[in-house]
């Protein structure tokens, strides 16, 4: 009203020709014409808070956020961005208005967020809030959906800022656990952005376009369910919206729900309640806790209490950057030829990972399952008992993770032989890696029992075929054995396999293959 200073908030877009870092400034660069941001007094704020219309900026663009103050006398000011204070140098224009500017050069993701300007004048103190986000200009993107309260209605809107425009659907389930799997008959899908029926057991929103499908689950605490052994944990990045639903059912309406963060009631405007009668005339109440854009200080234990149920809590952790926590040490496994076995990786990650399993340069789809303790697990069982090296690779917007596995299949050796003018070689891929013996077949030893020890050269792991180790043994030809049949035998704990070779001319001459168990 007329007692308050007249505030004008403007955005100035600059032609990009500067490469220095963003700074608070009193003299902005040469630019395009200023855009009015309709500064409005924020309703029901403690203190005088003006908010500028939301600002969207292209990546690498340079802008100035500017405030013009029509108030008598001097002003002092302070900019605050992500809890850091930035200097502020007001000056006065030709109409004697106070001018305060914040220049952001070469806009990046880290410079997006809320900019607060605190102004102190001779008459009053007030705050101006600018919210700056990056315009999505990527060709094709698929972003994880997030929730927003429908403008002044008891309904949630599901939004996925993706290109091309994704198809958004709500995936609802009213039963517990395994029966809420995607293909289950208990699952109902609604291809719409707005959801009014918010009382269900499990609520997810999914967005899909040419790049695939991404889903976000509405984090829920159910006071009628036995609490998990470990406290449920919810991770969010700074600037993301927080939504937690607390649900309780009681025989009648005589109960209430409340949210607390670290034993302090949530501020009004950060929660809303809905209630309905179920088919058996019991009362269902849900209480949403929400923060439209979280900051570090929104971290903590959120507790939902009821006058008729034991309270339950969830730990909300706000991080600056996404992460993937898992042990990356390589793991070796040996299994029998028909043994059932799956590789598995247990990890904690935020945002949700995209992952692949790779074997022999071929990638396989990767499934993840959430565990009760906040960890997730990915299993790979489709190895078809092929020995070798398997790679698990995971990534999200901020982190990457790779883990190697070696699979060895216990089996009797199988021998392949080849001979040249100067030597004979035998190869085997059995596991455990076999040991070798060479024997000479002669009139004196028709059963080939005369052992050859001279000129033998064994090499374990001669070549690695996609992680599959091959053992070889080479016999150098000498006059003593030229023209004779020789037998190479590979043996391990599961058996022996032999190959007989005639040592008279080059070329492979597998003569007889013996399989001695």
């Amino acid at each position: 009203n007329q007692d308050l200073p007249v505030i004008k908030c403007v955005l100035i877009n600059h032609k990009n020709n500067d490469s220095s870092v963003g700074k608070s400034s009193s003299y902005p660069m040469v630019s395009e014409s200023p855009e009015d941001l309709g500064c409005a007094l924020r309703p029901q704020s403690s203190g005088t808070v003006y908010e500028a219309a939301a600002v969207e900026v292209d990546v690498s663009a340079s802008i100035t956020l500017q405030v013009l103050v029509d108030a008598p006398g001097n002003i002092s000011c302070l900019w605050v961005f992500k809890h850091s204070s930035l200097n502020c140098q007001p000056h006065f224009d030709l109409q004697n208005r106070g001018v305060v500017s914040m220049v952001i050069l070469k806009m990046t993701e880290t410079q997006a967020g809320e900019y607060l300007l605190f102004i102190q004048s001779e008459a009053t103190n007030y705050t101006i809030l600018f919210t700056v986000s990056i315009r999505n200009t990527l060709l094709y993107t698929l972003r994880r959906p997030y929730f927003r309260k429908m403008e002044n209605q008891d309904a949630l809107v599901c939004i996925s800022e993706s290109v091309p425009e994704p198809i958004v659907e709500w995936v609802l389930c009213d039963s517990q656990g395994e029966s809420c799997k995607e293909e289950s008959p208990a699952v109902v899908k609604k291809e719409e952005k707005v959801l009014h029926e918010l009382f269900g057991t499990d609520i997810r929103c999914c967005a899909r376009n040419e790049l695939g499908r991404e889903c976000t689950r509405l984090f829920t605490i159910d006071l009628n369910q036995t609490p998990q052994t470990t406290l449920p944990q919810l991770f969010l990045k700074v600037g993301e919206p927080l939504w937690i639903r607390c649900k309780a059912v009681h025989v009648n309406h005589g109960f209430g729900l409340t949210w607390e963060l670290e034993n302090k009631a949530l501020e009004e405007g950060n929660y809303f309640e809905m209630s309905t009668y179920s088919t058996n005339r019991t009362m269902i109440r849900i209480l949403f806790a929400f923060v439209s854009s979280v900051a570090r200080n929104d971290t903590g234990y959120y507790t939902c209490s009821s006058s008729k149920h034991p309270s339950q809590s969830a730990l909300v952790t706000i991080v600056e950057k996404g992460f993937i926590n898992a042990t990356n040490s390589s793991e070796d496994y040996e299994i029998d030829q028909y043994e059932e076995f799956c590789f598995s990786v247990r990890f904690k990650a935020y945002p949700q990972i995209r992952c692949t399993w790779t074997f022999s340069r071929k990638s396989f789809p990767c499934e993840q399952k959430g565990l009760d303790n906040g960890y997730s697990i990915s299993k790979f069982c489709n190895h078809k008992h092929q020995p070798g090296e398997y790679i698990f690779h995971a990534e999200n917007d901020d982190a990457q993770f790779t883990k190697m596995f070696t699979l060895n299949i216990r089996r009797k050796p199988q021998v392949l032989a080849e001979a040249s003018a100067s030597q004979a070689s035998c190869f085997s891929d059995g596991y455990p890696l076999p040991s070798w013996t060479w024997k000479k077949c002669s009139d004196k030893s028709p059963n080939c029992t005369e052992e050859i020890t001279e000129g033998v050269w064994n090499r374990k792991a001669n070549r690695k075929v996609f992680g599959q180790w091959v053992s070889s043994s080479t016999l150098n030809m000498s006059e003593a054995i030229k023209g004779f049949l020789v037998k190479c035998c590979a043996y391990n704990s599961l058996g022996t396999s032999c190959e007989t070779i005639l040592l008279n001319s080059p070329g492979p001459f597998p003569f007889i293959q013996d399989n001695i168990s």
Epitope: Q44, E114, S133
Partner: antibody, heavy 127, light 107 residues
């Protein structure tokens, strides 16, 4: 300074299509959730909200006139266009465009109605 | 759609009078209501938004109150320049809707 200026024919015949243009300055139609509404007022009668369009191309129309209205924008020209088909003498009115700033962040937008209006353009429907 | 009912449709008052205009919504709209003033031949001008927040530059004799379905605009001491028609607008859910106006004229 924010200004909105309506332009279009002052006279249209019944059954014809009316095309009105709102040219804006002092703010950008491409900025986050900045919107423009069309409102009309028949002579001596109430204000009637017709339609809006936001920077992300989100649109909404008056329920009773939905089938006849189309709203679009050309950000590069800073223009919002409203077309109304099958005009009738009862559509004689002053047509206004007005700005709707969207407040909030990446994830949560809210509105406080129209803050700045154009001066209006009078349209008469008569044969 | 949400219907907005304004009353009275017109009133006569003198300079210095305290004037109250009411607006009723057909369903709860929280505090998502704006008040506009319109003078003959001119475009409407926003006085109040969010039911009770006075637009910057608007005289402090104008005030708004209410929440849910019942709202009021009060002019504490009517001035000559306040003779005009006043409209309420719900900006709670689309389609937005106006009340049909209250004309304040000189007694």
């Amino acid at each position: 300074q924010v200004t909105l200026k309506e332009s279009g024919p002052t006279l249209v015949k019944p059954t014809e299509t009316l095309t009105l243009t709102c040219t804006v300055s002092g703010f950008s139609l491409s900025n986050a959730r900045m919107g423009v509404s069309w409102i009309r007022q028949p002579p001596g009668k109430c204000l009637e909200w017709l339609a809006h369009i936001f920077s992300n191309d989100e649109k909404s129309y008056s329920t009773s006139l939905k089938s006849r209205l189309t709203i679009s924008k050309d950000t590069s020209k800073s223009q919002v266009v409203l077309t109304m088909t099958n005009m009738d003498p009862v559509d004689t009115a002053t047509y206004y465009c007005a700005r709707i700033p969207g407040y909030g962040g990446n994830f949560y937008y809210h509105y406080y109605g129209m803050d700045v209006w154009g001066q209006g353009t009078t349209v008469t429907v008569s044969s | 759609d949400i219907q907005m009912t304004q009353s009275p449709s017109s009133l006569s008052a003198s300079v210095g009078d305290r004037v109250t205009i009411t607006c009723r919504a057909s369903q709860g709209i929280r505090n998502d209501l704006a008040w506009y003033q319109q003078k003959p031949g001119k475009a409407p001008k926003r006085l109040i938004y969010a039911a009770s927040t006075v637009q910057s530059g608007v005289p402090s004799r104008f005030s708004g109150s209410g929440s849910g379905t019942e709202f009021a605009l009060t002019i504490s001491s009517l001035q000559p320049e306040d003779f005009a028609t006043y409209y309420c607008l719900q900006h709670n859910s689309f389609p937005w809707t106006f009340g049909c106006g209250t004309k304040v004229d000189i007694k």
